[in-house]
Interface confidence: low
């Protein structure tokens, strides 16, 4: 069966609609579209002949219709007058006609709705507000949204019969509910912008902040008044009933006690016409100055004077407290407070009382503490002490006495020796004292504040210390086996014992060592080279003992018989001759070499290179000690051979006491001495 489908059925104004014929026969001659529910030539839109592909518009063609060969009708830019029925007449090739009718509806596209109100500024819990969704349009459904939710059931909300008006009752303050209305028709859905209600309220009773009374003088006072109100309240400040200013904040810089009083804030709502007030009391206190302590006696005498300490200055509304050594004042028989706590009396103050006193003042805005005060307790002088007490003193030492007496203020000191004033210093210094400095030493201590004097006496004894002894000798350079030496311990001292040490050992008596003159003189008979010492003497008495520096004797001896080395007597020709001579002697001897009686040189060593047979002969080493005046010598006969020969050893010695060599030496003496001294 032939049917017509409208795509879409509901068409928005200005859009297009497509009418489609369904179940169209196969063998078509053509078809005609009509406006309306029947075939009416006057309402023909257009026709189509399939075979010729010819489309002919009819009287009802508006220029917006398009007929297609597939039996569809497209109408563009539809208007509300296009609403209705449309009929298609299908002409088959056998000229049998078939008809079908379809329809569609055209609706306007809805505008965006908006909400109007009969009261934009309702008063809280009092006014009802009627919200109306505009504009009013036909075929439109109205809906409401509250806070983006569909309209809830509530006694506070009431809809009109057409849903276009929503009445809101009993609106609370701070109602932030969002209201929107929605319009609907078959072709569109539109929603309004949200509307919230500006609920008028207040003012409530204002609050004043901050409430941090009491205030300090010199601070600023900054009070803020706030009252819940819509519209915002206007504020008025009154101080002690007098209008000050119409601001929300009241600011008074650098307040004084005169700014104390009753501060009232009045809040006014110009919309509701209501006023509310709040009062606060402000108290301003002066910041206390730093207190200080005065005393009726800054310098009390120990265990005698009472001292009254007063906390200054005296100020109103002030609490006074006392601190003793950083502790709150505790009950004591030595401390007494006045009724107002401003005065503290201290009794029986001991010396060296280091207690420190502080007073504290308090009011509601400040706590101040004074600097500490200590009492300068006068005392003394006590009996002075003299130090050090290391009598007896040695003559020649320094006497350095110090006097000290406990005293406040510090004592002045005066020294008297055997009753005679010496000096006014704390220390008495006498350099290089003698026995004449023995005596009675008195120190007087004077306190010019208390006017008191105290003295102490000490006896000083000075003794003569033994001098350090020394050894004198009658002969510092004795000759061995010839001289006797007398060592004397100096000086001569009375009541003194003399002692001797030799080689750090106490002297042991022997036939060659003799003591005399109360052991003060030590005689060495016929000294030997082993008697060099060292020698020390000591003196001692009941006070002291002293020992001399060591003394050594320079015992001159020798020269002993010299020794020539090496001992060889025979040498090969061409060899080097290297002879060395040595003799024990003090002082060291002088060495001379003679060859075959002729003086060759004054050395200890004789060296001849590449000797020949001409070097055969008597080689004499001559030693001389000018201190002892003694000489000695030795002769070695040297033979030089051209061939190998066994070395031999032989030597002839000659001492200074006389030998065959002496004649040779005598002959050389003038030349030798001349050479020696140049």
């Amino acid at each position: 069966q032939l049917t017509i489908e409208s795509r879409p059925f509901n068409v928005a104004e200005g859009k297009e609609v497509l009418l489609l014929a369904h179940n169209v026969s196969q063998n078509l001659f053509g078809y005609i579209w009509y406006k309306g529910e029947r075939v009416d030539a006057s309402r023909r839109i257009g026709s189509c002949v399939i075979r010729t592909q010819q489309i002919t518009p009819g009287p009802a063609h508006s220029g917006r219709e398009t007929i297609d060969f597939n039996a569809s009708l497209l109408i563009q830019n539809v208007t509300q007058s296009d609403t209705g029925s449309y009929t298609i007449q299908v002409i088959k090739e056998d000229l049998v006609n078939e008809e079908a009718t379809g329809q569609f509806r055209v609706y306007p596209e809805l505008p965006k709705p908006y909400i109007t109100s009969n009261n934009s500024n309702p008063i809280e819990d009092k006014d009802a507000v009627a919200l109306t969704c505009e504009p009013e349009t036909q075929d439109t459904t109205y809906l409401w949204w509250v806070n983006n939710q569909s309209l809830p059931v509530s006694p506070r909300l009431e809809l009109s019969s057409d849903n276009r008006t929503l009445t809101v009752f009993n609106i609370p303050r701070n109602d932030t509910t969002s209201y929107k209305c929605e319009t609907q028709n078959p072709v569109s859905v539109r929603r309004s912008d949200p509307v919230t209600l500006n609920v008028l309220y207040g003012p409530d009773a204002p609050t004043i902040s901050p409430l941090n009374t009491p205030y300090r003088a010199g601070e600023y006072l900054n009070l803020t008044c706030h009252a819940a109100s819509n519209p915002t309240a206007q504020y008025f400040w009154f101080v002690n009933g007098t209008f000050q200013q119409s601001t929300q904040e009241l600011f008074i810089p650098n307040i004084t006690v005169n700014n104390s009083g009753s501060y009232m804030c009045q809040a006014h709502n110009s919309a509701t016409g209501l006023n509310r007030t709040t009062v606060t009391a402000i108290t301003v206190y002066a910041e206390l100055p730093k207190p200080y302590i005065t005393s009726n006696n800054s310098n009390p005498i120990e265990d005698k004077d009472a001292v009254t300490l007063t906390c200054e200055p005296e100020t109103q509304d002030t609490t006074y407290l006392w601190w003793v050594n950083n502790q709150r004042l505790s009950v004591s028989s030595r401390l007494e407070l006045s009724n107002d706590n401003r005065t503290l009396t201290v009794f029986n103050i001991p010396r060296n009382d280091t207690t420190f006193y502080e007073c504290e003042t308090q009011n509601p805005v400040s706590v101040r503490r004074s600097d500490p005060v200590t009492l300068n307790v006068l005392y003394g002088p006590d009996a002075p002490t003299i130090s050090p007490l290391n009598t007896p003193y040695r003559a020649g030492e320094n006497l350095n006495l110090s006097c000290h007496a406990a005293s406040n203020p510090a004592a002045q000191y005066f020294w008297f020796v055997n009753g005679t004033f010496q000096q006014s210093t704390q220390e008495l210094f006498i350099p290089n004292i003698t026995v004449n400095n023995s005596g009675s030493y008195m120190c007087q201590a004077h306190n010019s504040a208390t006017g008191l004097n105290r003295t102490t006496v000490t006896a000083i004894t000075v003794y003569v210390e033994l001098p350090k002894p020394y050894i004198s000798s009658n002969n510092s350079n004795p000759i061995e086996d010839k001289d006797a030496v007398t060592l004397t311990c100096e000086p001569v001292a009375e009541n003194t014992t003399y002692l001797w040490w030799v080689n750090n050992q106490s002297l042991s008596v022997s036939p060659r060592l003799q003591l005399s003159n109360g052991n003060r003189i030590l005689t060495l008979l016929s000294v030997t080279r082993n008697d060099t010492g060292p020698y020390e003497c000591g003196i001692q008495n009941s006070e002291s003992a002293k020992r001399s520096d060591p003394v050594t004797l320079n015992v001159t001896y020798g020269p002993d018989t010299p020794i020539i080395s090496p001992p060889d007597l025979s040498y090969r020709s061409g060899a080097n001759l290297n002879l060395s001579c040595h003799s024990d002697s003090n002082p060291s001897p002088q060495y001379s070499w003679l060859i075959n009686g002729t003086l060759r040189q004054h050395t200890q060593v004789l060296f001849i290179s590449k000797i020949t047979s001409n070097n055969n002969g008597a080689y004499a080493c001559f030693v001389s000690n000018l201190a002892t005046g003694r000489n000695n010598s030795i002769v070695k006969n040297i033979s030089v051979s051209s061939g190998d020969s066994a070395p031999g050893s032989s030597g002839l010695s000659a001492s200074g006491s006389g030998s065959g060599l002496n004649d040779i030496f005598e002959a050389q003496k003038i030349e030798w001495h001349h050479h020696h001294h140049h």
Epitope: Q426, E427, F429
Partner: antibody
Framework: EVQLVESGGGLVKPGGSLKLSCAAS????????MSWVRQTPEKRLEWVAF????????YYADTVKGRFTISRDNAKNTLYLQMSSLKSEDTAMFYC?????????????WGQGTLVTVSA | DIQMTQSPASLSASVGETVTITCRAS??????FAWYQQKQGKSPQLLVY???ILAEGVPSRFSGSGSGTQFSLKINSLQPEDFGTYYC?????????FGSGTKLELK
């Protein structure tokens, strides 16, 4: 005759150092406590430092504490003042003085002074 | 510290006159008090100590008095050599402090 002779003064830059000496004669130096006293260009007298007769005790004015050191050598009969971290306000004539009575006595003998100038 | 307040700062007088200089201590110093004389280009010299004791060699026309906080120096029959600057000082312990000085000038 008592004599105190100061030496060692001169021109020094701020922050610099100087050592003053005071040679004593004519009295038993080791018996006396000694002080240094200075006189500012405005003629104000200021006590600077103190030392006891054997050097066991020393004291200083607050203005010089930590910067100046007083010492003595009794064997040489000499008093010293070592000055460091000098400031322009240290410019003065420096005198050494011997005390009666120590810390409770006056300045009995004075030297002739030595001038210290602290300037950039 | 103890402050010494000396007055007058300067004083003009003629030879033969009598003058008095005063000094006040900020606290009780008993008799720990001295006077010094300083002449132009010279070092100070001790005149009086312990408030009233004349130092060695000081002429008897000088006299010191006072105790506690008030002190004075009196010079009878001024002599030409007495002109100069006078300083007061406490010797009541460390720190020692001086007055600011009194300049005595010839009128």
């Amino acid at each position: 005759e008592v004599q105190l002779v100061e030496s060692g003064g001169g021109l020094v830059k701020p922050g610099g150092s100087l050592k003053l000496s005071c040679a004593a004669s004519g009295f038993t130096f080791s018996s006396y406590d000694m002080s240094w006293v200075r006189q500012t260009p405005e003629k104000r007298l200021e006590w600077v430092a103190f030392i006891s007769s054997y050097g066991g005790r020393t004291y200083y004015a607050d203005t010089v504490k930590g910067r100046f050191t007083i010492s003595r050598d009794n064997a040489k009969n000499t008093l010293y003042l070592q000055m460091s971290s000098l400031k322009s306000e240290d410019t003065a004539m420096f005198y050494c003085a011997a005390h009666y009575f120590g810390t409770s006595g006056p300045f009995a003998y004075w030297g002739q002074g030595t001038l210290v100038t602290v300037s950039a | 510290d103890i402050q010494m307040t000396q007055s007058p700062a300067s004083l003009s007088a003629s030879v033969g006159e009598t003058v008095t200089i005063t000094c006040r201590a900020s606290e009780n110093i008993y008799s720990y008090f001295a006077w010094y004389q300083q002449k132009q280009g010279k070092s100070p010299q001790l005149l009086v100590y312990n408030a009233k004791i004349l130092a060695e060699g000081v002429p008897s026309r000088f006299s010191g008095s006072g105790s506690g906080t008030q002190f004075s120096l009196k010079i009878n029959s001024l002599q030409p050599e007495d002109f100069g600057t006078y300083y007061c000082q406490h010797h009541y312990g460390i720190p020692f402090t001086f007055g600011s000085g009194t300049k005595l000038e010839l009128k």
